[in-house]
Interface confidence: medium
């Protein structure tokens, strides 16, 4: 009869390497008498005999993990006990080996230049995979801006345009290599103005081209603003090359303005804009005798529309920054004040003021205003508006009407050309062509070029002294 013998583990457990989903077996060979009871633990926790993931055979000496999972990693021990002596134990590690697997692959990214981009690449594998990145067809080199994090993610600080491209991450260990799909890194660039429009100081009627060049990704759109509003006139030409948009605004300059170039592009739901402004000013016309101090154009205002001849070309004085607006403002101010004058004076004064402020242009190719004939000026002064004119003279020779902003010049009759000398050198006010005693009504007021016939009007000399500077506003 055999003598009792305490258990001896003749084959200690060894470290077992196993691939996921494969079988892993620990062998615990025991010699003893009587036959021992063998139990198994994993990480000090007893493996239950009825756990279907395990198979325990050969009287408990063989433990088989039927389909290894990543979580099966750990220390496995067999404990043998037959009641003779103490229990004996042998332990070994299960190292779950895993080909690299990319658990969180990178995705397409749109990022604004200058920001930080992170392309994820989370991996699994045993041994732990090393992660590298490929850009296009080449291995990506790390530098002060570009780093592969411990997690495997690619971090790019201060993203530049040249960082744009196709990327993939590569996870590699001794068991194999895994590649992510190609992803695209798109670098968006805030709209930026490369070339701002230049300010110009030009003469009235010049053509000016304002040029604005902008860059951005996506390519920006360029819009132009004139004095805070969309540009109402001028032609815009645009071209795009290498993500640079070149916009040229051609203007026909009739008034000064602030022109703003606005470059805009979209980043997701947000927009980025860049602005640059240029002024177009109208040069002071030099006082040399070659410079006409204005230009001739059709009257486009409202105040004198019924007074001036239809389609007449009138003279606009470029000593004003914006002649047409300035002259219209002057006449508008005066017009309101004329409400106070007598019904006899008012239409005559309106005709005089309109034809004086908007003098007819003499025919020809160089702009020259044609003043009112002296005789018609005197008719208004001494006949139609005698009472008002005297009252005006009494107000310190500064004019009946003041707005504080402008002083409207009333013509000094004595300085106007006489139609007796040259009927073609001045403008007449035809509705005044009546004898004094016949003036009871006022026909529609239009001005015209004088003809040779001389109206029955006051003599060219004034019956009282004319002050050197009359003005109305």
């Amino acid at each position: 009869e055999k003598l009792p013998k305490a258990p001896v583990i003749t084959t200690p457990l060894e470290t077992v390497d196993a691939l996921v989903e494969e079988v892993a077996t620990f062998m615990c060979a025991v010699e003893s008498y009587p036959q021992p009871e063998i139990s198994w633990t994993r990480n000090k926790i007893l493996i239950k005999l009825f756990d279907t993931r395990y198979s325990i055979r050969e009287n408990g000496q063989l433990l088989t993990i039927l389909s290894v999972e990543d979580s099966d990693d750990g220390i496995y021990c067999c404990i043998a006990n037959n009641g003779v002596g103490g229990a004996v134990e042998s332990c070994g590690a299960l190292q779950v080996k895993m080909k690299p697997k990319i658990t969180r692959p990178p995705i397409n990214v749109k990022i604004i230049e200058g920001l930080k981009a992170v392309l994820p690449c989370t991996t699994m594998g045993n041994p732990k995979p090393s992660v590298s990145w490929i850009k296009g067809d080449n291995a990506l080199r790390e530098n002060s801006r570009i780093a592969v994090l411990e997690s495997g993610s690619l971090r790019i600080h201060n993203v530049q345009k040249e960082d744009a491209g196709q990327y993939r991450c590569v996870a590699k260990n001794s068991l194999g290599t895994a590649y992510s799909k190609l992803v695209k890194l798109e670098v968006e660039v805030f709209a930026r103005i490369l070339r701002a429009p230049e300010s110009h100081n030009v003469t009235f009627g010049s053509f000016v081209t304002l040029r604005c060049t902008a860059i951005g990704i996506p390519v920006p759109t360029i819009s132009w603003i004139e004095n805070g509003n969309a540009v109402s006139s001028g032609s815009i030409q645009e071209s795009v090359k290498d993500r640079v948009i070149d916009s040229r605004l051609q203007l026909f300059i009739t008034k000064p303005g602030l022109y703003t170039c606005i470059a805009t592009n979209k980043h997701g739901e947000k927009f980025s804009t860049a602005k640059a402004a240029a002024t177009v000013s109208i040069a002071e016309w030099s006082k040399s005798q070659k410079d006409s101090q204005g230009y001739c154009a059709q009257y486009r205002g409202e105040v004198c529309d019924a007074v001036l001849a239809k389609d007449a070309l009138v003279f606009f004085n470029t000593s004003y920054r914006d002649p047409e607006d300035a002259q219209e403002l002057l006449i508008h101010t005066a017009w309101n004040e004329l409400k106070a004058v007598s019904p006899l004076c008012r239409p005559a004064a309106e005709a005089l003021l309109c034809n004086h402020l908007f003098q007819e242009c003499s025919p020809g190719v160089v702009p020259t205003p044609m003043p009112i004939c002296r005789e018609y000026c005197l008719a208004v002064k001494e006949l139609f508006c005698a009472k008002e004119w005297q009252a005006m003279e009494g107000k310190a020779h500064r004019g009946l009407y003041r707005s504080g902003m402008h002083l409207l010049p009333v013509p000094e009759c004595s300085k106007l050309p006489s139609m007796h000398r040259d009927p073609t050198a001045c403008t007449r006010l035809p509705y005044l062509d009546y004898k004094k005693e016949n003036i009871t009504t006022f026909p529609s007021i239009t001005s015209s070029r004088p003809s040779a016939d001389i109206p029955n009007l006051p003599a060219s000399t004034s019956s009282f002294a004319v002050s050197p500077a009359y003005s109305m506003t």
């Epitope: 009235f204 051609q250 026909f252 005798q289 230009y295 154009a297 389609d311 020809g364 190719v365 160089v366």
Partner: antibody, heavy 120, light 108 residues
Framework: QVQLQESGPGLVKPSETLSLTCTVS????????WSWIRQPPGKGLEWIGY???????YYNPSLKSRVTISVDTSKNQFSLKLSSVTAADTAVYYC??????????????WGQGTLVTVSS | SYELTQPPSVSVSPGQTARITCSGD??????AYWYQQKPGQAPVLVIY???ERPSGIPERFSGSSSGTTVTLTISGVQAEDEADYYC???????????FGGGTKLTVL
Amino acid sequence: QVQLQESGPGLVKPSETLSLTCTVSGGSISSYYWSWIRQPPGKGLEWIGYIYFSGRTYYNPSLKSRVTISVDTSKNQFSLKLSSVTAADTAVYYCARGGGLGISNWFDPWGQGTLVTVSS
Amino acid sequence: SYELTQPPSVSVSPGQTARITCSGDALPKQYAYWYQQKPGQAPVLVIYKDSERPSGIPERFSGSSSGTTVTLTISGVQAEDEADYYCQSADSSGTYWVFGGGTKLTVL
């Protein structure tokens, strides 16, 4: 970029009326002055007249009795009619922008010109 | 009728300076404008208001005015500058436009 293009018959009989049209492209005819200028073969330039977009015209005094310039803003065109032509009116006829009343007293740009021959 | 007088021809070697004059009684009062015309082509504005140069015109083109004479100066003349040059101005009353008879510039 404003461009001008003259069109019309290249041959006109003496005593008849020469008619040419200038089409403006790349910009509006409005707000500008538009001129006709001619150049007899081998000779210098002669200004014929201008028209403002509103229809206001002014002509070279030496040609005034025979010249009519008109404008069609809807078509962006202006036209020249020169009546009672003689062989002396044989020339290259140019249309150009400018030439009037202080708003661009110079001529720029020009059309490429069209040769009109007066001959029976 | 009013006239502007130009020399019929001016010759100059490449790199030299060419000066073309234009005389007229009204030139102290009226601006002059200069045009370049090459054979078979329309004239091109090279100087306006006596001395202003349009954009796109080389800096070698300049203009000046003195009394009844205006002058177009082309410094460092190039072969491509060979052309006819015309001055334009108005009569003294500004009634109509007049062109000079033209000057043929020959680059030797």
